[in-house]
Amino acid sequence: TPEVWVQVRMEATELSSFTIRCGFLGSGSISLVTVSWGGPNGAGGTTLAVLHPERGIRQWAPARQARWETQSSISLILEGSGASSPCANTTFCCKFASFPEGSWEACGSLPPSSDPGLSAPPTPAPILRAD
């Protein structure tokens, strides 16, 4: 069964800067990745970035840099201030559309006890939805 993992890290140098890493553990070919915050995309969440392997990358503030790390994982750097700034309990979600498995989404947030610059290991997060 495919799984999605989500890792959230607060940067020690910039406390308003977060790095989100997401990966897909499956054998299919990824056709689209959507990163959102505040909940799953389409269920109250706000889209931060969309990554298409053959068309490119689209991102919205406060996303600063979205990129593919491997064929099955992505990273997103967020930075902001005021209303657009992420906070420690913000939930980030990643949705992977893959053929033939379909769409798989998982969410994560900064570990409650984590110090700036630290993060939880990228273990698979609970799968919220599989279309």
Partner: nanobody, 118 residues
């Protein structure tokens, strides 16, 4: 399918300048890496310069200080300002785009000829 169209090539004297342009058909997504490659007669195609959508730039040593790559205000427009041109810069210049930066799908323009000759 992303289409790339180059323009700006031509005949120029040694020491002269040219500005190449490349327009991409993709207007929703940012293409992660765009670049210029060139192929001189009888030689292999070689990298000239690349730029990511976040502004990270690389040049081949032979053009450093003479060529400047940039991306325009229009999404996925690409430029190459070529100064102090030399005879050895004569080649067909190709625009290249790698939307993911992973090489999963790479697009090429049809090329524009640059001839440096007196």
């Amino acid at each position: 399918e992303v289409q790339l169209v180059e323009s700006g090539g031509g005949l120029v004297q040694p020491g002269g300048s040219l500005r190449l342009s490349c327009a991409a058909s993709e207007t929703y997504f940012d293409l992660y890496v765009m670049g210029w490659y060139r192929q001189a007669p009888g030689k292999d195609r070689e990298l000239v310069a690349t730029i990511t959508y976040t502004g990270s730039i690389k040049y081949v040593d032979s053009v450093k200080g003479r060529f400047t790559i940039s991306r325009g205000d229009a999404k996925n427009s690409l430029y190459l300002q070529m100064n102090s041109l030399r005879a050895e810069d004569t080649a067909v210049y190709y625009c290249n785009a790698d939307p993911s930066g992973l090489g999963r799908k790479v697009y090429w323009g049809q090329g524009t000829m640059v001839t440096v000759s007196s």
